[in-house]
Interface confidence: low
């Protein structure tokens, strides 16, 4: 239904303090350098011109696009083409040219200082003195280094934020009650932003269809009750919430969530018997508790699949005459039976499925081609099974930091060209799959481990496209997106890579280091690892071994020591020329 | 074209009971919503109850419901309802409906297939 305002028919539906959220998100993901008071003055300008437009629709300028009326109000900003460079040529464009423009110049990896967690009494204090600024400096900040960040589950994570604060500013131990909770929420947030980003990257490099392939399979586990169509509406819907969240359309995309939100909720009957308490909560909570609601049960005495979709003669009749809502019925009906697949392994049997039928349907006997197409889905299932078994038996002989270094050593003999943060940064996440999905039981750990690493490989996706080194990453993370995990499992030693020159700067190590925290220096050891492999790619696992065993005691004994720096020094030098001769440098 | 065929009306008391089927005459590839509607002499057409192709799900309008069930059978691609303690203001024309889209459907715009009627007369 059109409006005659956007911007006006958006605050009224979003209403002031959620509007002014998401403007402040969406300036902050695509001026991701521009000074907290940059945005909070350019946030209010928009806030009152909606008002004005509330007021009367028919005012000047109320009738124009949200992208138009936002692109305008980015490019007053005075300092655009010292700060952004070329991204100030977007604003010589027109829409939807400008927007588009604007959504390529997101960088997943801006060049930001790291967030540093003041004292809780100084937080407490920004907090009580200025609630407001305190909250919208959260949002700010959060969305700046997460361009892509779902917005609406931003507002989520801000109303938990608030409510952190407001509950252990007051308690007895502020930091006992602050520092998990705090560090629960950048946990969160920093997987939130992962899956999120995949979402964005399915939708903007592979296409509308391929989302809605992984919709429907995800959907149709999560809700195996629901009928076909009912998953298709909810496909179609949530697709059109991402679609607009990922092109910067923030407002659209809140509004549009809380429609399907309140759908679910009206038809959760005909949806899910998982819903209920999930539709008790506000709006912001029930958003979130609806797209981490757990499987329903599945319907008792479902046929079997070959029936409609092997031995059926109108197979071929039926694929002809809508290809994708037969294609997407079998993914519907495949899907809803297996919870126990990753939802990567059931779009890899959908794809297998559909190949098959594109040949066997112009052969002579097309039943006879077809027949026995479950038979190829045998070796696809049992190869991500048979690699989560070896990986999580690695992982409980190795325990996660261990397993992190032999996936360290594992990805950057595949791809040393890759920069060491992040190699460090994606084999670190890789091994958290471990500690994440080896606990659960065999029903539970393929969608868990496969789907948790698809997430992973996507951050190595476009961290790599923003300064590609490497053409086998270029290759794995272009080719299928689906296929990623195993084209990277099945990458071998890269025999083509020349070893880096040694450099001693690299591995000398001082004595502020005793002071980092437990993880801050398991990374620095971990930067050193890779390193050193890609000094000497050819290097044993015990040679490595040796070498990294004979660092920790190095940096045990330096911490011990009185003078630490000296000590760093001197027994730098004779670890790196125990090392060097260690590895045959 | 989908045809909808209906049948198992007829003249009862109060009190009784009476199962009506609806066939279609091809299993609607892209049907996933059956509906029954009746409309009373002098009446509008209102709706009955539905069900999702499966029969999963079935919803019901409120005079109708603990009374009335819907069922369906999806190899002799037939929707049944069947109508207990029938009362004389359930006399109607009872009418089958298919629809293409999705959700709990209640209104006639929604639905894209219709059967001819089946007469229920329950007397007093």
């Known amino acids: 239904d059109a409006h005659k305002s956007e911007v006006a028919h958006r605050f009224k539906d979003l209403g002031e303090e959620n509007f002014k959220a998401l403007v402040l998100i969406a300036f902050a993901q695509y001026l991701q350098q521009c000074p907290f008071e940059d945005h909070v003055k350019l946030v209010n300008e928009v806030t009152e011109f909606a008002k004005t437009c509330v007021a009367d629709e028919s005012a000047e300028n109320c009738d124009k696009s949200l992208h138009t009326l936002f692109g305008d109000k980015l490019c007053t900003v005075a300092t655009l083409r010292e700060t952004y460079g070329e991204m100030a040529d977007c604003c010589a464009k027109q829409e939807p040219e400008r927007n588009e423009c604007f959504l390529q110049h997101k960088d997943d990896n801006p060049n930001l200082p790291r967030l540093v967690r003041p004292e809780v009494d100084v937080m407490c204090t920004a907090f009580h003195d200025n609630e407001e600024t305190f909250l919208k400096k959260y949002l700010y900040e959060i969305a700046r280094r997460h361009p892509y960040f779902y917005a609406p589950e931003l507002l989520f994570f801000a109303k938990r934020y608030k409510a952190a604060f407001t509950e252990c500013c007051q308690a007895a131990d502020k930091a006992a009650c602050l520092l998990p909770k705090l560090d629960e929420l950048r946990d969160e947030g920093k997987a939130s932003s992962a899956k999120q980003r995949l979402k964005c990257a399915s939708l903007q490099k592979f296409g509308e269809r391929a989302f809605k392939a992984w919709a429907v399979a995800r959907l149709s586990q999560r809700f195996p009750k629901a009928e076909f169509a009912e998953v298709s509406k909810l496909v179609t819907d949530l697709t059109k919430v991402h679609t607009e969240c990922c092109h910067g359309d923030l407002l659209e995309c809140a509004d549009d969530r809380a429609d399907l939100a309140k759908y679910i909720c009206e038809n959760q009957d005909s949806i899910s018997s998982k819903l209920k308490e999930c539709c008790e909560k506000p709006l912001l909570e029930k958003s979130h508790c609806i797209a981490e609601v757990e499987n329903d049960e599945m319907p008792a005495d479902l046929p079997s699949l070959a029936a409609d979709f092997v031995e059926s003669k109108d197979v071929c009749k039926n694929y002809a005459e809508a290809k994708d809502v037969f294609l997407g019925m079998f993914l519907y009906e495949y899907a809803r039976r297996h919870p126990d697949y990753s939802v990567v392994l059931l779009l890899r049997l959908a794809k297998t499925y559909e190949t098959t039928l594109e040949k066997c349907c112009a052969a002579a006997d097309p039943h006879e081609c077809y027949a026995k197409v479950f038979d190829e889905f045998k070796p696809l299932v049992e190869e991500p099974q048979n690699l989560i078994k070896q990986n999580c038996e690695l992982f409980e002989q190795l325990g996660e930091y261990k397993f992190q270094n032999a996936l360290l050593v594992r990805y950057t003999k595949k791809v040393p060209q890759v920069s060491t943060p992040t190699l460090v940064e994606v084999s670190r996440n890789l091994g958290k799959v471990g500690s994440k999905c080896c606990k659960h039981p065999e029903a539970k750990r393929m969608p868990c481990a496969e789907d948790y690493l698809s997430v992973v490989l996507n951050q190595l996706c476009v961290l790599h496209e923003k300064t590609p080194v490497s053409d086998r990453v270029t290759k794995c993370c272009t080719e299928s997106l689906v296929n990623r995990r195993p084209c990277f499992s099945a990458l071998e030693v890269d025999e083509t890579y020349v070893p880096k020159e040694f450099n001693a700067e690299t591995f000398t190590f001082h004595a502020d280091i005793c002071t980092l925290s437990e993880k801050e220096r398991q990374i620095k050891k971990q930067t050193a690892l890779v390193e050193l492999v890609k000094h000497k790619p050819k290097a044993t696992k015990e040679q490595l071994k040796a070498v990294m065993d004979d660092f920790a005691a190095f940096v045990e004994k330096c911490c011990k020591a009185d003078d630490k720096e000296t000590c760093f020094a001197e027994e730098g030098k004779k670890l790196v020329a125990a090392s060097q001769a260690a590895l045959g440098l | 074209e989908v045809q909808l065929v209906e049948s198992g009306g007829g003249l009862v008391q109060a009190g009784d009971s009476l199962r009506l089927s609806c066939t279609a005459s091809e299993r609607p590839f892209s049907t996933y919503v059956m509906g029954w509607f009746r409309r009373a002499p002098g009446k509008e057409r209102e709706f009955v109850g539905g069900i999702t192709w499966s029969g999963i799900n079935a919803w019901y309008t409120d005079s109708v419901l603990g009374r009335f069930t819907i069922s369906s059978d999806n190899a002799k691609n037939t929707v049944y309802l069947q109508m207990n303690s029938l009362k004389p203001e359930d006399t109607a024309v009872y009418y089958c409906?298919?629809?293409?889209?999705?959700?709990?459907?209640?209104?006639?715009?929604?639905?894209?297939?219709w059967g001819q009627g089946t007469q229920v007369t329950v007397s007093s």
């Open positions: 409906a298919a629809a293409s889209g999705v959700g709990r459907y209640r209104y006639e715009l929604q639905y894209d297939y």
